[in-house]
Every structure is written in structure tokens, then in C-alpha cells.
């Protein structure tokens, strides 16, 4: 899916509003200085690739973030604001569900949610130069 | 402006089944969950389903789960909830409702009355 | 699911300001949302995010949520203030929507 098209301002307003708590409470116990962001984005439309890639695709050593409530959530808000997004996702989403896991939180999985709260916050600040 | 209009709603015996629906207008209904939020007489309100956009998803509160089925036709605008094995405690106004970024509800319909009795 | 308990009443005179609570186990860790419902009405959303506004809402409706207590305040209440509210939020085990049982706001 092709990002450019959504509105960017709308997710960032939901994602203040409705997903960065939930992302804090499942990371909650481990320090801020845990883990090392190694995944960044360059971009709005690079960022929500990267965190749609990270939240929904199941990877070595967590494949369980996809039912999470920050996941659920970025899901719904993806739908609403980015034109064609929900229609692209049939497919993928009938797929995912064959595969539904149980909900197990790994240090894989914290990581990566580590890497995620990294996008989201640079997606919220697009007007910083790239480190 | 955004509308959720529901209807189906009546009077049926215990143990009977019921079809309720939701027209939907004024907004991109193929791009909201939606959820299905009842309030029995003189009580609170009890979340009852919802489903995803693509109806990949649907989740039920224990009160219903195997009794009760969400689904959607995005082709009309449509949401509906399948009762079955009704009980006389499934007696309530049902709200159809959108819901906002999964979490919470933003926009109520006015309610449809289901009346279990003998 | 968890669960959410809210005074059964409150009452406060015209002008004064009402506080409604919503208690539950690490609430201040979800988000919680406000709803208002007047006799023979559907719902309507007043908070949003633990302390957000929808458009519409009068500046007197304010919210905030910590530790394991979520407050409702409406300064200088107003009698169209009267109404039931509902506190609302989520459960992340099952993602259910959860609600509090509801306060009956009156306004003396």
C-alpha cells in the first residue's frame, strides 16, 4: 500500500489520542534504555510503512503484536485515513487470521514494540532532519 | 450528516431469534468498525460486539458469545446482529454504533427495543 | 475483562463543579472515554483520550485519568448538565469495550 495519500495529521492526532499510551503500558517494566532503535524512516508515507510492516507482519520470535489494542487501533485508524487502505487489506487480513496466534509477550516482541514507539515518534516530528 | 438508523427490533418468546439491522449513512462505512452496544431497562450500557471494517474481526462480550453474531454488507451500508437462543435478560434497547479507532464509540444510532417474554 | 465502578449519584448546585470518578485496576494505563445520556436519548460522547474534547462539547466538560482513578469534571454545571454519564474502557486481554455502571448527575 502506498502511504502518500493519507491524511497525516488526523493519525497523528490519533495516534496521541488513542494508540502511544497503550504501546507505553505494554512496554511497561522495561527500561527506555533497553533496547537500540535500529529501524528508522525517512518520511510520513516511509514511517507508516515501516510500522504497518512491523505491527502486522509476524517475524522471527514474535508473531502476536497483530492483536494487540495498539495494533487493533493503528489498524482502525489506517482504515480511516488513508483512501483504499481497508480494501487493500482484505486479503491480507483473511490471511493473517488463518495464522492468529495466542497473545505472548517475548523480548523479540518488546523490542520491536520498542522500534515502533522510535517510528511513531519520528512520524509525529517530519520536519526533523534524519540523525 | 452521519446516521445510523436501526430496525428489527420487537417482541419475541424466550428461546426464539431476532435480526436486527443498522442503515448506515453520511460517512465511508467500509472504513469503521462497528458495534452493537445494548441497555436493558433502567440499566447501564453493555458493549456487545463489534466487527472489523473487512469483517475480519469480530468479538463478542461473554453474555452472548455463541448466541449472537455480527456481520456487515459494506455493499449497503449495512450492520446486523443475529440473535438467537434469546433470554428474557437480552431485554434492552440496542444501540448500533460506530466505532472510533477500535477503542471507543463516537457516533450512537437511536436504538432499536428487543422485548424477550413469554 | 475489568471492571469499572462509578458512584451510583452525584448532585451539585448550579455553578458548582461536579467531579464524577471512575475507578478500576491500572486504568491510568488505558485510555478512558466520558459519555452523556439524557432520559429517552442515545449516548453522546464528551471525552475522549482521558482529556479530549469532541467539537461541540462545552469547555466546562474536562477529564483526567492516573493511577487507578479516571475523573469526569464539569465546572460550573449547568441544569442541562443533568444527565446519566458513563465512563468507558477497554480490556488488553479480550479487547472488549467495558463500561462503568453509570452516575446520575443531578443538579439541584
Known amino acids: 500500500y502506498d502511504f502518500t495519500n493519507c491524511d497525516f495529521e488526523k493519525i497523528k492526532a490519533a495516534y496521541l489520542s488513542t494508540i502511544s499510551k497503550d504501546l507505553i503500558t505494554y512496554m511497561s517494566g522495561t527500561k527506555s534504555t533497553e533496547f537500540n532503535n535500529t529501524v528508522s524512516c525517512s518520511n510520513r508515507p516511509h514511517c507508516l510503512t515501516e510500522i504497518q510492516s512491523l505491527t502486522f507482519n509476524p517475524t522471527a520470535g514474535c508473531a502476536s503484536l497483530a492483536k494487540e489494542m495498539f495494533a487493533m487501533k493503528t489498524k482502525a485508524a489506517l482504515a480511516i485515513w488513508c483512501p483504499g487502505y481497508s480494501e487493500t487489506q482484505i486479503n491480507a487480513t483473511q490471511a493473517m487470521k488463518k495464522r492468529r496466534k495466542r497473545k505472548v509477550t517475548t523480548n523479540k516482541c518488546l523490542e520491536q514494540v520498542s522500534q515502533l514507539q522510535g517510528l511513531w515518534r519520528r512520524f509525529n516530528r517530519p520536519l526533523l532532519k534524519q540523525q | 450528516q452521519v446516521q445510523l438508523v436501526e430496525s428489527g427490533g420487537g417482541l419475541v418468546q424466550p428461546g426464539g431469534s431476532l435480526r436486527l439491522s443498522c442503515a448506515a449513512s453520511?460517512?465511508?462505512?467500509?472504513?469503521?468498525?462497528m458495534s452493537w452496544v445494548r441497555q436493558a431497562p433502567g440499566k447501564g450500557l453493555e458493549w456487545v460486539s463489534n466487527?472489523?471494517?473487512?469483517?475480519?474481526?469480530?468479538y463478542y462480550a461473554d453474555s452472548v458469545k455463541g448466541r449472537f453474531t455480527i456481520s456487515r454488507d459494506n455493499s449497503k451500508n449495512t450492520l446486523y446482529l443475529q440473535m438467537n437462543s434469546l433470554r428474557a435478560e437480552d431485554t434492552a434497547v440496542y444501540y448500533c454504533a460506530r466505532q472510533q479507532y477500535f477503542d471507543h464509540i463516537d457516533i450512537w444510532g437511536q436504538g432499536t427495543l428487543v422485548t424477550v417474554s413469554s | 475483562d475489568i471492571e469499572l465502578t462509578q458512584p451510583p449519584s452525584v448532585s451539585v448546585a448550579p455553578g458548582q463543579t461536579a467531579r464524577i470518578s471512575c475507578g478500576g485496576d491500572s486504568l491510568g494505563g488505558k485510555y478512558v472515554y466520558w459519555y452523556q445520556q439524557k432520559p429517552g436519548q442515545a449516548p453522546v460522547l464528551v471525552i475522549y483520550?482521558?482529556?479530549k474534547r469532541p467539537s461541540g462539547i462545552p469547555e466546562r466538560f474536562s477529564g483526567s485519568n492516573s493511577g487507578n482513578t479516571a475523573t469526569l469534571t464539569i465546572s460550573g454545571t449547568q441544569a442541562e448538565d443533568e444527565a446519566d454519564y458513563y465512563c468507558q474502557s477497554y480490556d488488553l486481554g479480550s479487547l472488549n469495550l467495558v463500561f462503568g455502571g453509570g452516575t446520575k448527575l443531578t443538579v439541584l
Open positions: 453520511g460517512f465511508t462505512f467500509s472504513s469503521y468498525y
Open positions: 483520550g482521558d482529556s
Open positions: 466487527i472489523s471494517y473487512d469483517s475480519s474481526d469480530t
